[in-house]
């Protein structure tokens, strides 16, 4: 994120609710901080679309967070 | 049907002021972001100022950062964005736009993605030198 300041959240609105599995190349989660006071999703598209975040509230989040969680624990 | 109406452009002289309106319909305003970017001639279409109706957050570009201020009527489903001491370079097309999980750090070279975000048709602001 080379624009990223300190202090602010990198999401602005509530989110997708889904995106296509097929369209994922990868998915970050931010845990809040001082930066940002909430948790956020961060979907990295496939052929170069750029990126979206993902409603932590969604289903589809809840499936990545506990996906990653597992993985890293 | 989502459709989004600008208006307010036109032509100012350097220093002056103009206040864009956009009017959003057929989709709920709290799931989206809404937003004004703008392109001038032979540019990338850039992020200007966005607003998130479901919690009043705000983004702005650097570049008009105290002296653009946006803000939404959540009764209107419009939102507007006061533009004051206007500078030449600010001269482009502005575009109103609703998204959703738009990331900040990617505003200054926005990729739209039709399943994400919807656009209205622009409204010309030209500022004289």
């Known amino acids: 994120f080379p624009m990223f300041k300190r202090g602010r959240c990198l999401c602005i609105g509530p989110g997708v609710k889904a995106v296509k599995v097929a369209d994922i190349e990868k998915a970050s989660i931010m845990y809040p901080s001082n930066n940002c006071d909430k948790i956020e999703v961060i979907i990295t598209l496939k052929e170069n679309k750029g990126q979206r975040c993902l409603n932590p509230k969604s289903k589809q989040a809840r499936l990545i967070i506990k996906k990653v969680e597992r993985k890293n624990f | 049907e989502v459709q989004l109406v600008e208006s307010g452009g036109g032509l100012v002289q350097a220093g002056g002021s103009l206040r864009l309106s956009c009017a959003a319909s057929?989709?709920?305003?709290?799931?989206?972001?809404i937003g004004w970017f703008r392109q001038a001639p032979g540019k990338e279409r850039e992020g200007v100022s966005i607003?998130?109706?479901?919690?009043?957050?705000?983004y702005y570009a650097d570049s008009v950062k105290g002296r653009f201020t946006i803000s939404s009527d959540n009764a209107k489903n419009t939102v507007y964005l006061q533009m004051n001491s206007l500078k030449p370079e600010d001269t482009a097309v502005y575009y109103c736009?609703?998204?959703?999980?738009?990331?900040?750090?990617?505003?200054?070279?926005?990729?739209?993605?039709?399943?994400?975000?919807?656009w209205g048709q622009g409204t010309q602001v030209t500022v004289s030198s």
């Open positions: 057929g989709f709920t305003f709290d799931d989206y972001a």
């Open positions: 607003i998130s109706s479901s919690d009043g957050s705000t």
């Open positions: 736009a609703a998204g959703q999980g738009w990331v900040i750090a990617t505003m200054t070279s926005f990729r739209a993605h039709r399943e994400y975000d919807y």
